[in-house]
């Protein structure tokens, strides 16, 4: 049985236009930047800036290019062989356990802790206890515990499927 393609992996089939380049599959597969035709006899190029495929494949359509959300910046554009690369804007980060959204970095550490790591697009500020040097768990502290202002509300979810 074939593997599922999940929503985050998928993208739309673009019906082959006459001007799209065609070539023959090699051992039943089409090269990156192409998808296979309905009859399996041709490889049809993906449309630059619209869709892509990254591997040799027998998918019947190319994958949809991601569009960076507001709250994200585009690091590199979508090509026929590579999806768009988006990154959270300065002052926000994307957590591993909630990759669908950019969250605002905390503006300060809780009382009794010091900042040892800056906000990056992939991590919040890092805080450690002054005395012990152990890291803060990362939970958002209660308002009254914070040295400065409380964290802002999360940015809108990042759409990974375009």
């Amino acid at each position: 049985e074939s593997a599922l393609i999940t929503q985050q992996d998928l993208a739309p089939q673009q019906r082959a236009a006459p001007q799209q380049k065609r070539s023959s599959p090699s051992e039943g597969l089409c090269p990156p930047g192409h998808h296979i035709s309905e009859d399996g006899r041709d490889c049809i190029s993906c449309k630059y800036g619209q869709d892509y495929s990254t591997h040799w494949n027998d998918l019947l359509f190319c994958l949809r290019c991601t569009r960076c959300d507001s709250g994200e910046v585009e690091l590199s554009p979508c090509t026929t062989t590579r999806n768009t690369v988006c990154q959270c804007e300065e002052g926000t980060f994307r957590e591993e356990d909630s990759p669908e959204m950019c969250r605002k970095c905390r503006t300060g550490c809780p009382r009794g802790m010091v900042k040892v790591g800056d906000c990056t697009p992939w991590s919040d500020i890092e805080c450690v206890h002054k005395e012990s040097g152990t890291k803060h768990s990362g939970e958002v502290p209660a308002v009254e515990e914070t040295v400065t202002s409380s964290p802002g509300t999360p940015a809108s979810p990042c759409s990974l499927s375009g």
Epitope: I5, Q7, P12, Q13, R15, P25, D39, D58, L60, F61
Partner: antibody
């Protein structure tokens, strides 16, 4: 558990239209094509066409172009097939069935709906 | 369109005995990628079809190993090594090498 549950039997007059639904559950709806088949009384199966829920692309058997229109509602994981200008020869059981997005494994149907009987009679 | 034919169209069987169904296509089902897209389904009475065998000889998950498929080119066979009462129904072969995909007329298997 993968399930495809179709709408109930319909009786229609010649010239009318009918819309059959197929609600999917137990898998990622946008991860598979949804196909439709026709089984006329005492007859074999005919492949009508398929719908790509991911990008809303359709691919029809030439014989059913203009007769069947395939759509989906992704919010409810439901596929639809509308048959127009009904005639007595459209009387059949219609099945939905899923297939994979890959050419090599996309031509067979691993799960089927229970079927919907459409009767066209004046 | 590819025409699929099956024989016999009706097959009375005895439980415990073997059974064999033949399927022929009007053109070779060997694709240019060297794979053969011939599949078998069983439609039990009052039910929808269920996939038994895909690509000539691959048993779908949950299908008992008494079912086997073989063949090449235009000639294919579905064998049941020992028929059981639950195997009754109509067996269809189907091809997806050529668009549009087509089905055979079906072989009705019933207990003698």
């Amino acid at each position: 558990e993968v399930q495809l549950v179709q709408s109930g039997a319909e009786v229609k007059k010649p010239g009318a239209s009918v819309k059959v639904s197929c609600k999917a559950s137990g898998y990622s709806f946008i991860g598979y094509f949804m196909n439709w088949m026709k089984q006329s009384p005492g007859m074999s199966l005919e492949w009508i066409g398929r719908f790509n829920p991911y990008n809303e692309d359709t691919f029809y058997n030439q014989k059913f172009k203009g007769k069947a229109t395939l759509t989906v509602d992704k919010s409810t994981s439901t596929a639809y097939m509308e048959l127009s200008s009904l005639r007595s020869e459209d009387t059949a059981v219609y099945f939905c069935a899923r297939s994979a997005y890959y050419f090599d494994s996309g031509g067979y149907f691993d799960y089927w709906g229970q079927g919907t009987l459409v009767t066209v009679s004046s | 369109d590819i025409v699929m034919t099956q024989s016999p169209l009706s097959l009375p069987v005895t439980p415990g005995e073997p059974a064999s169904i033949s399927c022929r296509s009007s053109q070779s089902l060997v694709h240019s990628n060297f794979n053969t897209y011939l599949h078998w389904y069983l439609q039990k009475p009052g039910q929808s079809p269920q996939l038994l065998i895909y690509k000539v000889s691959n048993r779908f998950s949950g299908v008992p190993d008494r079912f086997s498929g073989s063949g090449s080119g235009t000639d294919f066979t579905l064998k049941i090594s020992r028929v059981e009462a639950e195997d009754v129904g109509v067996y269809y072969c189907s091809q997806s090498t050529h668009v549009p995909w087509t089905f055979g007329p079906g072989t009705k298997v019933e207990i003698k």
